[in-house]
């Protein structure tokens, strides 16, 4: 099967809406940056349609997308993260669509890790900890992070608690007695650099001690 | 400007392991491209044997990849290619070139050095 | 392995020809193609790169298409010193392969 788009395929892909999103990574693995685009509508035909970016670049013009099933994808240490760049969407040579757009504006951070929760006995409450990457980077360093937790049994009752740091204290009193908890940690770019929210962190899962009765307070694990 | 160039004995003997060097200037190695040996049979055509990253990572061609070491010397601007218990088939002009992974191309290549396998 | 297969694999011609060569990928490769021009002697130079982009320093009769599977290098008017041979290279996937090469001959 040949690369080359036949005019009736152009012509179909006129009709097609190659909108896309991308999301950015900094300093993702060491000094490389990673950049990822997808089309917005899953239908799309991408068999011969490629991404481009050019522009706000080191050292290069335009860097080409490698294509991983529905997902394309650049890992470089050339993007410039001053200006706009213009991403393309391509078939053979043509440009069917094109955004440009600033890569600092679209961050989305590496979803925080070693999330876990430890209960303090004496001072009846919970310390929730967890880590994230972007401590050690130079650029995305500064993030919000959204803490949601629920008890077991309540399907959509989230509660979210935003912070930025990575401890977080929760009042034993606040929480229902007994009860199992789910807990989860994501975070967003909070200082120069906007984007996008991160992955979820992995679940973590802990339970409320029981109240004692004599004295009104619960029981440690 | 960006210059490779290729160093190394032009004669290694069969079963030997063969060493060659390349030397950049004008770029640091360890400041970004993937840094690459190619080889070239006489009268034949073009063979990539693996490169090493600016991060010091390394990818060989599988064909090659037990025999093949590839490493560098920062402190130099350095990167070599080492070839284990070598046969005549390994008889080559051996280029070093600056390029791949994230670019689509060898922009900057050595002149090249040649190496006969041979008692 | 990706194949890169070239052809012609050689082809005779005159100062002021049109000359293509073609580049079939056994998979799709995207737009990660380069070409090279090698001379007797020296090291390969490059011409294109990204399938379609005419590298620093290269002549403009020296075009690249294609992508996908099918490239194409055409060289608008042949000039004396353009009679060398030329590679095909995919960096789509490793190992990183070059097409057999094809050599432009004086006719």
């Known amino acids: 099967e040949s690369g080359y788009a036949q005019n009736g395929d152009l012509e179909d892909a006129e009709l097609d809406d190659y909108s896309f999103s991308c999301y950015s990574q900094l300093e993702v693995n060491g000094s490389q940056h990673s950049l990822t685009c997808a089309f917005e509508d899953p239908d799309v035909n991408i068999t011969n349609l490629e991404f481009e970016i050019c522009g706000a670049l080191v050292e290069v013009k335009c860097l080409n997308f490698r294509k991983l099933q529905e997902i394309y994808f650049i890992e470089t240490k050339k993007f410039l993260l001053i200006g706009k760049s213009n991403i393309c969407v391509k078939v053979g040579e043509k440009s069917l669509t094109c955004k440009k757009i600033d890569l600092t504006t679209i961050v989305k951070p590496e979803a925080p890790f070693d999330l876990s929760v430890v209960y303090r006995e004496g001072a009846n409450d919970f310390v929730v900890t967890f880590n994230t990457s972007h401590l050690q980077k130079k650029y995305v360093k500064v993030l919000m992070h959204d803490v949601a937790y629920r008890q077991e049994k309540d399907e959509n009752k989230w509660t979210h608690v935003n912070l930025s740091s990575t401890k977080l204290t929760l009042l034993q009193r606040k929480l229902q007695p007994a009860a199992m908890y789910e807990i989860k940690v994501r975070s967003i770019p909070d200082h120069y650099f906007k984007g996008f929210w991160s992955e979820w962190s992995p679940s973590y899962y802990f339970r409320t001690p029981e109240i004692n009765n004599s004295s009104g307070e619960m029981d440690p694990i | 400007q960006v210059q490779l160039q290729e160093s190394g004995p032009g004669l290694v003997k069969p079963s030997e392991t063969l060493s060659l060097t390349c030397t950049v200037s004008g770029y640091s190695v360890s400041t970004d491209y993937a840094w690459n040996w190619i080889r070239q049979p006489p009268g034949k055509g073009l063979e990539w044997i693996g490169y090493?990253?600016?991060?010091?990572?390394?990818t060989y061609t599988p064909s090659l990849k037990s025999r093949v070491t590839i490493s560098r010397d920062t402190s130099k601007n350095q990167f070599s290619l080492k070839l284990s218990s070598v046969t005549a088939a390994d008889t080559a002009v051996y280029y070093c070139?600056?390029?791949?992974?994230?670019?689509?191309?060898?922009?900057?290549w050595g002149q090249g050095t040649t190496v006969t396998v041979s008692s | 392995d990706i194949q890169m297969l070239q052809s012609p694999s050689s082809l005779s011609a005159s100062v002021g020809d049109r000359v293509t060569i073609t580049c079939l990928a056994s998979q799709t490769i995207g737009y990660w193609l380069a070409w090279y021009q090698q001379k007797p002697g020296k090291a390969p130079k490059l011409l294109i790169y990204?399938?379609?982009r005419l590298a620093d320093g290269v002549p403009s009769r020296f075009s690249g298409s294609g992508s996908g599977t099918m490239f194409t290098l055409t060289i608008s008017s042949l000039q004396p010193e353009d009679f060398a041979t030329y590679y095909c290279q995919q960096f789509f996937s490793y190992p990183w392969t070059f097409g057999g090469g094809t050599k432009v001959e004086i006719k």
């Open positions: 090493i990253f600016y991060s010091g990572s390394t």
């Open positions: 070139a600056r390029g791949g992974y994230d670019v689509n191309y060898f922009d900057y």
């Open positions: 990204a399938a379609t």
